[in-house]
Interface confidence: low
């Protein structure tokens, strides 16, 4: 087994159970899961007088580490005082040690009740450019309570000094306020208060609540695709305005950014729908650098019908970052429909969602109306996954049989790009990027006379091209043929194709 | 853009106490994340002291907690660094850094040399 | 403390070569890693960070990766300015920087 350092744990008794007059009493501390032996346990019994014993270690029997117990007996006055108890185990480290101090008995005691306030926003409906948040931890028996703040589940660094703390009777309350950007209220994070007390954890958490809306209207907003952020590197966000019913009386919609900076000109365009309703749209350029770095943007619409300001923001999303996978096929040959072919890629295990999809051909991007990919779906584990499906045909095979299938995403390294290539007809082309591939030059057609081929495009044939048996040193199934130019002094070259 | 701009006495006695500030312009020290102080020594190894972020919170390395204080007058966008008790040990170049989320430094000012000599 | 060793003090490369500096962790530090360049009298300019993402308006020919506790910054092309010290950092506990790699252009 390999070298495991011990996991401690103070045993003490029950306060009410030790008689008040009990002159001495024994308390314990249990270091278990460690392995190889020893350990060696020492007591700070501070100013008074104890005598130890340690028991000799057993061997855990699952896991073959061992556990030891070293028990303090002490006498005195003994009520008021810590006790510390020092595992150190070498073989972890010449340093290991681990540090237990607690008193001879525990308490009974009430557990604190854990509550998140939050200052309100102003009578507009906008956040303030601070929020307090205001951590109650009340109805508790005194004693030790830490306070933590979390954002995400991450350690926050927060001035705990101005924790307040007063006594109600038999209990006690603690407060402790968290003051936060509106930048970071607004990115949609959650906080946690987290209080550790008699070694228990209470936590209670809050993060800013969805939007509701006056009833019948939407708002949406979108973050800048993939593409536009990492290809173009111009990336937009558009502001979604739809089910307004048209009236007089202008919809503005306004951007702004939590940094106070100032935003970019944006486009408006609107539409009337067949319903009779109005959808109103407003996209904003944002800096690649200003998305990256974690800028939130607002869009604020307004209208003399709304009872009130509906308000959207937008921030890259947060949370685990991991790379797509992506798979290409194609399907075999369908009867009825041999001069289609549909490609199909499977995208997957990537986070956060947000993902372009892309298909090249003769490296040329298709237009995105040539394929359908669905929305990222979760998969069984953490991640997204997505499916894209595009058709092609024999005249595009026959031109270049190699289909590319690109995800843009930001955890794709480096350069946000992963594609991956694929054939219609798998061995001749090459199924990926890396494969070995013949010059595009001529190709080799079905039926067509033995010994004049017909060039790539119908042009003139190629004078010295013939289609012979299968080559061994071509990848590919050997009833296919090859065309090989039979050019005097030099390598041949090769063309895969049908003949 | 963000610019920083170091100042300070450039050459302190040693076991006296050593201020330096930092004026940001282009951007207010109170609208997000995190004010630094990094040091370079003569011989290039870097070391970062600590920062003071936008609510005020600050953090220091843990070899320098009992002599480092960072400090901020908001209604002048400045920020500070008092060291104290300097020693010839703490002779580098004193860079102020905006760190725009905690984790690593985009807008460094340009330094400032600062000489601990009797 | 979490100390990054960059275990080549100098390295010597041409104009248009390919070079990868590197960086080790003494334990885990996730992808929290950031790459910085200084050029001769100047301050340090971040040019990685999370171990691969590159920093708005540096040239694509920085690519930041990670194995395990090892990480690189590799310049796919070399230019003559790109002469200058390049340090790693760690954010994954508080922060510490590399001792540095002076790049030297023949």
């Known amino acids: 087994a390999s070298t495991q350092s011990p996991s401690v744990f103070p045993l003490t008794r029950c306060c009410k159970n030790i008689p008040s007059n009990a002159t001495s009493v024994t308390l314990g501390c249990l270091a278990t899961g460690y392995f190889p032996e020893p350990v060696m346990v020492t007591w700070d019994t501070g100013s008074l007088n104890g005598t130890t014993m340690t028991l000799p270690a057993t061997t855990l029997t699952l896991s073959g580490h061992y556990a030891t117990i070293s028990l303090l007996t002490v006498s005195g006055a003994w009520a008021k005082q810590m006790f510390t108890c020092r595992v150190a185990h070498t073989p972890s480290s010449t340093d290991w040690v681990d540090n237990k101090t607690f008193s001879v008995c525990s308490r009974d005691f009430t557990p604190p009740t854990v509550k998140i306030l939050q200052s309100s926003c102003d009578g507009g409906g906008h956040f303030p450019p601070t929020i307090q948040l205001l951590c109650l931890v009340s109805g508790y028996t005194p004693g030790t309570i830490n306070i933590t703040w979390l954002e995400d589940g991450q350690v926050m660094d927060v001035d705990l000094s101005t924790a307040s703390t007063t006594q109600e009777g038999e209990l006690a309350s603690t407060q402790s306020e968290l003051t936060l950007s509106q930048k970071h209220w607004l990115s949609d994070r959650t906080y946690t208060c987290q209080v550790t007390y008699q070694g228990h954890t209470f936590e209670d958490s809050t993060k800013k609540c969805a939007d509701s809306n006056p009833r019948g209207v939407s708002a949406y907003l979108s973050r800048p695709s993939p593409f536009d952020l990492f290809i173009r590197k111009s990336p937009t966000i558009t502001c979604l305005v739809v089910d307004l019913a048209p009236s007089k009386g202008t919809v503005n919609l306004t951007w702004s950014r939590a940094s106070g900076k100032p935003v970019n000109h944006s486009t408006r365009k609107e539409e009337k729908q067949r319903n009779g309703t109005l959808t109103v749209t407003s996209t904003l350029p944002v800096g690649t650098r200003d998305w990256i770095e974690g800028e939130t943007y607002q869009c604020r619409v307004t209208h003399p019908h709304l009872p009130r300001a509906l308000m959207r923001s937008t921030t890259k999303t947060s949370g685990p970052r991991a790379a797509p996978e992506v798979y290409a096929f194609a399907t075999p040959e369908w009867p009825g429909s041999r001069d289609k072919r549909t490609l199909a890629c499977l995208i997957q295990n990537f986070m956060p969602e947000d993902i372009s999809v892309q298909w090249l051909h003769n490296e040329v991007q298709l237009p995105d109306a040539r394929h359908s990919t669905t929305q990222p779906r979760k998969t069984k584990g953490s991640g997204f996954f997505v499916f894209s499906r595009l058709e092609v045909t024999r005249a595009e095979w026959e031109q270049k049989d190699e289909f590319i299938c690109r995800a843009v995403h930001e955890a794709a390294s480096p350069s946000q790009t992963v594609q991956r290539a694929v054939s219609v007809n798998p061995g001749l082309a090459g199924g990926s990027a890396q494969s070995q591939r013949a010059p595009d030059r001529v190709l080799c057609h079905s039926g067509q006379q033995q010994g004049l081929p017909r060039a790539a495009g119908g042009s003139v044939p190629h004078p010295r091209c013939h289609c012979g048996a299968g080559r061994a040193d071509w990848p590919g199934p050997p009833e296919l043929d090859v065309c090989v130019e039979e050019a005097e002094g030099e390598a041949p070259w090769t063309w895969t194709g049908l003949c | 853009d963000v610019q920083l701009l170091e100042s300070g006495p450039g050459l302190v006695k040693p076991s006296q106490s050593l201020s330096l500030t930092c004026t940001v312009t282009?951007?207010?020290?109170?609208?997000?994340?995190?004010w630094n102080w990094i040091r370079q020594f003569p011989g290039n190894k870097l070391e970062w002291l600590g920062y003071?972020?936008?609510?005020?919170?600050?953090r220091y390395n843990p070899s320098l907690k009992s002599r480092i204080s960072i400090s901020r007058d908001t209604s002048k966008n400045q920020f500070f660094l008092q060291l104290n008790s300097v020693t010839s040990e703490d002779t580098a170049t004193y860079f102020c850094v905006y760190g725009s989320s905690q984790r690593f430094f985009d807008y460094w000012g340009q330094g400032t040399t600062l000489t601990v000599s009797s | 403390d979490i100390v990054m060793t960059q275990s080549h003090k100098f390295m010597s490369t041409s104009v248009g070569d390919r070079v990868s500096i590197t960086c080790k962790a003494s334990q885990d530090v996730s992808i929290d890693v950031a790459w910085y360049q200084q050029k001769p009298g100047q301050s340090p300019k971040l040019l990685i960070y999370s171990a691969s993402w590159r920093y708005a308006g540096v040239p694509d020919r920085f690519t930041g990766s990670r194995s395990g506790t090892d990480y690189t910054l590799t310049i796919s092309s070399v230019q003559a300015e790109d002469l200058a010290v390049y340090y790693c950092?760690?954010?994954?506990?508080?922060?510490?920087f590399g001792s540095g790699t002076k790049l030297e252009i023949q």
């Open positions: 282009g951007y207010s020290i109170t609208s997000d994340y995190a």
């Open positions: 950092q760690q954010h994954y506990n508080l922060f510490t």
């Open positions: 003071i972020n936008y609510s005020g919170t600050t």
